[in-house]
Interface confidence: medium
C-alpha cells in the first residue's frame, strides 16, 4: 500500500467539518519524487489540501472539509498517473444526527397472547444506523424506586414496536417502561411509563346474541328488542362497563348510545325504538372504574322490533248494487292517528248476528282498500278493522241506512290546472257531518269500480279540490253525497274536464262548383270527440298568386262557403281552420284555378 488516509472522525454531525490526512510512503518507487496528492469526495476533486514532505521522506497532505453535507460519501486520496487518477486510499464518511427522543410511547396488554405490546414514534430520520431498545424494570408504587431490570425487548429492524412476552411480564406489580435510541452520535431516552399491564389491557367486546324465545316468556312489547351478550372469556375477571349503540338499518339516522351496561346480561330488553323496524346493534366495553381502553365495537347484530297494532281511523264509504241491493261494495281509507301508526297487514269486515253472543262472522279479509260482499238480510251494520301481527285497530262500525237527509244544491265543477278540478256546492240545512266526494271517468268510459273517493270531515265545507287521478282531456263524473248522524243525503253529480283538447284536425275542403270569379267549397264536419270542447267557429283563408291573403269567419254549423271576387284564370290556395275554446287546427291546403273568360261555368 502506497497511501493511507486517517480522519478526525468517520461519523460526524451533518454539516460539521472533518479533517483528513493522507501519507504516501517513500518506497513507492514508481512515483514521482515530488508527487502531487489530490483529494476527491465522491466524484468531485476537493481543493485546499496542504502538502508537505516529512523528515522520513514520506509525503503528507492534510485537508479540512468545512461542512460535510453528504449523509454518506467516500473520501479518496489520489495521484495523477499518466492520464488517469490513481486512488491510493479511501475512507467512508458518514454524517447524520444523534437520535431524537422517542415520543408517544404507549402500551397495550393483549390478554389473548398474554403479552404487552408497546409502540412509539422514533422521531426524525438520523441518516445513521440507529437501534431502539424497549427497556423495563420491576417496581412497586409509582416507579420512583427501580427494582430488578426486565430483559430488554429489541424490535425487528425498522419496526417501532416491541412485544414483551408473558414470561417477562409482571402481572402483580407495576413496571417502568421506556425506549432507548442509540447511534454513533449519541443516546436518547423516551419519558418513562409506569404501568400495571392490566391498566392498559386491550379488551375484546362481548358477543351480541338474540334471545331465544321461550314459550312461557312474554313477547317483547312494540318498539322493544330482547337480546343478551356473552362476555369475552379472557377478560371476565376485569371489572368493566359496557355500552350499546343502535340505529335503524334504513335511512340516515346516527347511532344512539345506551349505557352503562353490565358486562354480562342473561337478558336485556331495549325499548323506545321504532316498531317494525330493522336495527343494527353493537356493544363495546371498557375497564371500569379504573383506567383503560375501550374495546372495539362488536360485530353487528341485526334485529327487528315487534310491531304495534294499527292506530288508524278508517274512513268508510259504501255502495249497493242496483240489480242486487244486498250486495254491498265497501270502500275505506286508513288515516294515521299517530306519526307511527303501525304497519297494516290487511283488513277484516265482520258481522255479529244479534242473539249469538260472541259469534263474529267474517264477511271478507283483504289487503285491498275495498271489498264486495253479500249483506245478510238481518244485518244493518258491519265492523271494519285493520290488523297486523300485533293486533287490530279499534273497530269502525259501518251502518247501512236509507238516504233520508237533505241534498246539497248548486253542485258545480271547474278546472284549476290540467291535473286538478275544484268541485263546489251549497251546503244543505242542517249542516251535514261531512261529505263523500267520488270521481272517475265519465261516459263512455265510466266504471263504478274505478272511482276515487275522499271523505271531507268538515260539514261546513263548500268545496273540495280533486288532485288524485285527474288527467287532462278526460271527462270526469264527480259525485258528492252529504253524510249525517245516522243517514246520508241523496248523491248529486256533475261532469267536468280539467283541460280540454284543441280539435285534432279540421275538415277536408272539397270544390263543389267553380266559375271565372267564384268557387263554391264544401266540407264534412268532424264528429264530436270526448275530451275535446265543441267548435266555436271556422275561419277560411285563401291566397292568390301575388301572395295576397283573404279570410272569412264562419259559424260552427257551416258546411260550405262560396268565394266571390276572384280573378279569372288565376291560381288560389285555400285552407280551413277549425277553432274551439281550447285551440285551433288547420286543414290541408286546397289549390284551384278559376276559369278563363271564354270558358263555360262548371257545375
Amino acid at each position: 500500500e502506497c497511501g493511507h488516509i486517517s480522519v478526525s472522525a468517520p461519523i460526524v454531525h451533518l454539516g460539521d467539518p472533518i479533517t483528513a490526512s493522507c501519507i504516501i510512503k517513500q518506497n513507492c518507487s514508481h512515483l514521482d519524487p515530488e508527487p502531487q496528492i489530490l483529494w476527491r469526495l465522491g466524484a468531485e476533486l476537493q481543493p485546499g489540501g496542504r502538502q508537505q514532505r516529512l523528515s522520513d521522506g514520506t509525503q503528507e497532505s492534510i485537508i479540512t472539509l468545512p461542512h460535510l453535507n453528504h449523509t454518506q460519501a467516500f473520501l479518496s486520496c489520489c495521484l495523477n498517473w499518466g492520464n488517469s487518477l490513481q486512488i491510493l486510499d479511501q475512507v467512508e464518511l458518514r454524517a447524520g444526527y444523534p437520535p431524537a427522543i422517542p415520543h408517544n410511547l404507549s402500551c397495550l396488554m393483549n390478554l389473548t397472547t398474554s403479552s404487552l405490546i408497546c409502540q412509539w414514534e422514533p422521531g426524525p430520520e438520523t441518516h445513521l444506523p440507529t437501534s431502539f431498545t424497549l427497556k423495563s424494570f420491576k417496581s412497586r408504587g409509582n416507579c420512583q424506586t427501580q427494582g430488578d431490570s426486565i430483559l430488554d425487548c429489541v424490535p425487528k429492524d425498522g419496526q417501532s414496536h416491541c412485544c414483551i412476552p408473558r414470561k417477562h411480564l409482571l402481572l402483580y406489580q407495576n413496571m417502568g417502561i421506556w425506549v432507548q435510541a442509540e447511534n454513533a452520535l449519541g443516546t436518547s431516552m423516551s419519558p418513562q411509563l409506569c404501568l400495571d399491564p392490566m391498566d392498559v389491557v386491550k379488551l375484546e367486546p362481548p358477543m351480541l346474541r338474540t334471545m331465544d324465545p321461550s314459550p312461557e316468556a312474554a313477547p317483547p312489547q312494540a318498539g322493544c328488542l330482547q337480546l343478551c351478550w356473552e362476555p369475552w372469556q379472557p377478560g371476565l375477571h376485569i371489572n368493566q362497563k359496557c355500552e350499546l349503540r343502535h340505529k335503524p338499518q334504513r335511512g340516515e339516522a346516527s347511532w344512539a348510545l345506551v349505557g352503562p351496561l353490565p358486562l354480562e346480561a342473561l337478558q336485556y330488553e331495549l325499548c323506545g325504538l321504532l316498531p317494525a323496524t330493522a336495527y343494527t346493534l353493537q356493544i363495546r366495553c371498557i375497564r371500569w372504574p379504573l383506567p383503560g381502553h375501550w374495546s372495539d365495537w362488536s360485530p353487528s347484530l341485526e334485529l327487528r322490533t315487534t310491531e304495534r297494532a294499527p292506530t288508524v281511523r278508517l274512513d268508510t264509504w259504501w255502495r249497493q248494487r242496483q240489480l242486487d241491493p244486498r250486495t254491498v261494495q265497501l270502500f275505506w281509507k286508513p288515516v294515521p292517528l299517530e306519526e307511527d301508526s303501525g304497519r297494516i297487514q290487511g283488513y277484516v269486515v265482520s258481522w255479529r248476528p244479534s242473539g249469538q253472543a260472541g259469534a263474529i262472522l267474517p264477511l271478507c279479509n283483504t289487503t285491498e282498500l275495498s271489498c264486495t260482499f253479500h249483506l245478510p238480510s238481518e244485518a244493518q251494520e258491519v265492523a271494519l278493522v285493520a290488523y297486523n301481527s300485533a293486533g287490530t285497530s279499534r273497530p269502525t262500525p259501518v251502518v247501512f241506512s236509507e238516504s233520508r237527509g237533505p241534498a246539497l244544491t248548486r253542485l258545480h265543477a271547474m278546472a284549476r290546472d290540467p291535473h286538478s278540478l275544484w268541485v263546489g256546492w251549497e251546503p244543505p240545512n242542517p249542516w251535514p257531518q261531512g261529505y263523500v266526494i267520488e270521481w272517475g271517468l265519465g261516459p263512455p268510459s265510466a266504471s263504478n269500480s274505478n272511482k276515487t273517493w275522499r271523505m271531507e270531515q268538515n260539514g261546513r265545507a263548500t268545496g273540495f279540490l280533486l288532485k288524485e287521478n285527474i288527467r287532462p282531456f278526460q271527462l270526469y263524473e264527480i259525485i258528492v253525497t252529504p253524510l249525517y248522524q245516522d243517514t246520508m243525503g241523496p248523491s248529486q253529480h256533475v261532469y267536468a274536464y280539467s283541460q280540454e283538447m284543441a280539435p285534432s284536425h279540421a275538415p277536408e275542403l272539397h270544390l263543389k262548383h267553380i266559375g271565372k270569379t267564384w268557387a263554391q267549397l264544401e266540407w264534412v264536419p268532424e264528429p264530436p270527440e270526448l275530451g275535446k270542447s265543441p267548435l266555436t267557429h271556422y275561419t277560411i283563408f285563401w291566397t292568390n298568386a301575388q301572395n295576397q291573403s283573404f279570410s272569412a269567419i264562419l259559424n260552427a254549423s257551416s258546411r260550405g262557403f262560396v268565394l266571390h271576387g276572384l280573378e279569372p284564370a288565376s291560381l288560389y290556395h285555400i285552407h280551413l281552420m277549425a277553432a274551439s275554446q281550447a285551440g285551433a287546427t288547420n286543414s290541408t291546403v286546397l289549390t284551384l284555378m278559376t276559369l278563363t273568360p271564354e270558358g263555360s261555368e262548371l257545375h
Partner: antibody, heavy 118, light 107 residues
Framework: EVQLLESGGGLVQPGGSLRLSCAAS????????MGWVRQAPGKGLEWVSS????????PYADSVKGRFTISRDNSKNTLYLQMNSLRAEDTAVYYC???????????WGQGTLVTVSS | DIQMTQSPSSLSASVGDRVTITCRAS??????LNWYQQKPGKAPKLLIY???NLQNGVPSRFSGSGSGTDFTLTISSLQPEDFATYYC?????????FGGGTKVEIK
Amino acid sequence: EVQLLESGGGLVQPGGSLRLSCAASGFTFSLYWMGWVRQAPGKGLEWVSSISSSGGVTPYADSVKGRFTISRDNSKNTLYLQMNSLRAEDTAVYYCAKLGELGQYQFWGQGTLVTVSS
Amino acid sequence: DIQMTQSPSSLSASVGDRVTITCRASQGISSYLNWYQQKPGKAPKLLIYYASNLQNGVPSRFSGSGSGTDFTLTISSLQPEDFATYYCQQSFQYAQHFGGGTKVEIK
C-alpha cells in the same frame, strides 16, 4: 411482621350468605394483590379468587363465579369475600393470603371455617 | 384455565432420603410455578417461587427446577419436620390453580 387475620366464618344454611373479612398489617396493603384460598375437610387447596392492588382485576374460580364477590378497602387495610347462595360443597377453611410480585402466595392467615349445612 | 397435575399423590420415605415430586401444567407457564408445604391443621407455607427461587427462611435442602410444562420439587435429604403435604401452584394466569397435592409420609 406481616399479619393476616380472617373473621366472619360460621354455620350457615344452604342458600344463605356470609361475609368474610381479612385484616392486614405489617406491609403496605394498597401495593399488593390479595387472594382467598379454601380447603374442604380432608381435601387439597382450592384457589377461590384474587384481587389486584387497585381492585380493578378480580378473577374467580368457576365453582364460585356469580355467587362470590371479592373486594378490598385500602383505607382500612381489609380484604372481603361476600359469599351468596352458599352450597354444602362450599364448606371449607377459607384462607386469606398476600401475593408476591410473581403471583406466589407469600403470607397466609390462620384460616376461618365456613360450614354450610341445614 | 390451566390445570395442574401432581405426582405421586402420596409417597413413603425415610429420614435422609432424597425425595422428588413432579408437577405438570396443561399448557406452558414459563417459570411461573410455586411450591407450598402444609402440615395438618396449619396454614400452607411458601417454599419456592418462580420455579427455582427459595423463599426467605426456607432450608437449602429444598430446591425447584423446570420450565414450560414440567416442574420438580426436590428435598435432598428428608428431615423429620419435612413430613407434610406439598402443593404446586401456577401464577402464569390469574386463575391460579393448585395441584392436587403430594403427601410425604414416614416409611
